[in-house]
Interface confidence: low
């Protein structure tokens, strides 16, 4: 086999792809020194080891630059598959989420898991709930036994991706009307109450529109 190798590859072992980028190379052990800028990677094959020179280090390793020779060093970060440096992971093992160079089995508070990339991204942040509004039904505060009261909250920070849902920004609950019968037997609310209802409706609409404006802006920017 050895002789046939020499006959078919007259130039020398350098035509063996494993010797690409080497300054010194042997058929049995591969590279022992690499050209400038390339990374030396020591690979195990059973009981054997061989060296190769690579432009970038394989998965599970990072490029460590040194004056004598650049080397591929193994990632030591827990649950990390590939890393950029000894303490910054770029891809986590299956089932773990990447967050600021580390791997977590669940995303920290305020961050949401993005399943397609297995990263933790900034979640949707909402403000505090407003007070419950006036109990009303069909925009009236009298004339019925039961009505609905609503409260709202605003989006403080939109999510990093529009696929990440924001929590509810308006919610309603059943309430008992303060006045079962309208004064003077009329079912129409007073002018002042009418103004209040209008204000409250606008507040709810604004809060609900806010999220869709964010989404529309995001899509336009993509």
């Amino acid at each position: 086999q050895g002789n046939r190798w020499r006959r078919s590859k007259r130039a020398s072992y350098v035509s063996n792809p494993i010797c690409k980028g080497c300054l010194s190379c042997s058929k049995d052990n591969g590279c022992s020194r690499c050209q400038q800028k390339l990374f030396f990677f020591l690979r195990r094959e059973g009981m054997r080891q061989y060296g190769e020179c690579l432009h970038s280090c394989p998965s599970g390793y990072y490029g460590h630059r040194a004056p004598d020779m650049n080397r591929c060093a193994r990632c030591r970060i827990e649950n990390c598959d590939s890393c950029f440096s000894k303490d910054f992971c770029t891809k986590c093992k299956v089932g773990f989420y990447l967050h600021r160079g580390r791997c977590f089995d669940e995303c920290p508070d305020g961050f949401a898991p993005l399943e397609e990339t297995m990263e933790c991204v900034e979640g949707c942040e909402v403000g505090h709930w407003s007070e419950w509004g006036t109990c009303s039904r069909n925009n009236r505060t009298c004339g019925f036994k039961w009505g609905l009261e609503t409260r709202t909250r605003q989006i403080v920070k939109k999510p990093a991706k529009d696929t990440i849902p924001c929590p509810t920004i308006a919610e309603s609950r059943r309430c008992k009307m303060a006045m079962r019968h309208c004064p003077g037997g009329k079912r129409t609310p007073k002018a002042k109450e009418k103004r209040n209802k209008k204000k409250k409706r606008k507040l709810i609409e604004r809060a609900q529109e806010q999220h869709s404006v964010f989404l529309a802006t995001d899509r336009a920017n993509q």
Epitope: P17, R44, G46
Partner: antibody
């Protein structure tokens, strides 16, 4: 003597996930690299992805969004998980021992398992 | 996308020598190793040649591998054809993504 044996369901419904197991005897999975390869009914072979001895994975870019390869070192098994299957995923699935980059060859193969995707 | 093209079929007579080519679509055939596999009647593939021209133990020396830079191809040569050589033959190459050749059916006349 190294032996590989695939196991798993022979029939999977479209849109479901496919999970296969490769049981290895005669070789610790932590000392070699392992691949999944499939062969379509028209005989075309496709390399799906590999897991190196340290547990690192590399996948065929055409399957990257659907595939994951995991392992259980205590049982000396590695697994193929393929999400959202379609009838196009009907094939014979092989696990194989891979001689490492850059040598690119598979010296030991399992018998293969026929998987049909159909409703 | 990297593609390795093989002839769909080749045929030969008993005792004859045949060659199967595996032509790389882009890039140099010598930049990644080439291996060859034999598959008989829907059995599992069997490694015949690795690292261009190396033969695993148990594979007869009638099987040999080489490269032809002028056609940018890997070549599998089978000499002294035997009846048991009938079947499908596949090449494989690549680095970060392995790609199999399209496959060649060998039939004996």
């Amino acid at each position: 003597q190294i032996q590989l044996q695939e196991s798993g369901p022979g029939l999977v419904k479209p849109s479901q996930s496919l999970s296969l197991t490769c049981s290895v005897t005669g070789n610790s999975i932590t000392s070699s690299d392992w691949s999944w390869i499939r062969q379509f009914p028209g005989k075309k072979l496709e390399w799906m992805g590999y897991m190196n001895y340290g547990g690192g994975t590399y996948y065929n870019p055409s399957l990257e969004n659907r595939i994951s390869i995991t392992r259980d070192t205590s049982k000396n098994q590695f697994f193929l998980h393929l999400k959202s299957v379609t009838t196009e995923d009907t094939a014979t699935y092989y696990c194989a021992r891979e001689r490492p980059h850059p040598y690119a060859y598979f010296d030991v193969w399992g018998q293969g398992i026929q998987v049909t995707v159909s409703s | 996308e990297l593609v390795f093209t093989q002839p769909q079929s080749v045929s030969g007579s008993l005792g004859q020598e045949i060659s199967i080519s595996c032509t790389r679509s882009s890039g140099n055939i010598g930049s990644n190793y080439v291996s060859w596999y034999q598959q008989q009647s829907s059995n599992k593939p069997r490694l015949l040649i690795y690292k261009f021209d190396q033969r695993p133990s148990g594979v007869p020396d009638r099987f040999s591998g080489s490269t032809d830079s002028s056609s940018n191809s890997g070549i599998l040569t089978i000499s002294r054809l035997q009846p048991e050589d009938e079947g499908d033959y596949y090449c494989l190459s690549g680095y970060d993504k392995y790609v199999f050749g399209s496959g060649t059916q060998l039939t004996l006349l």
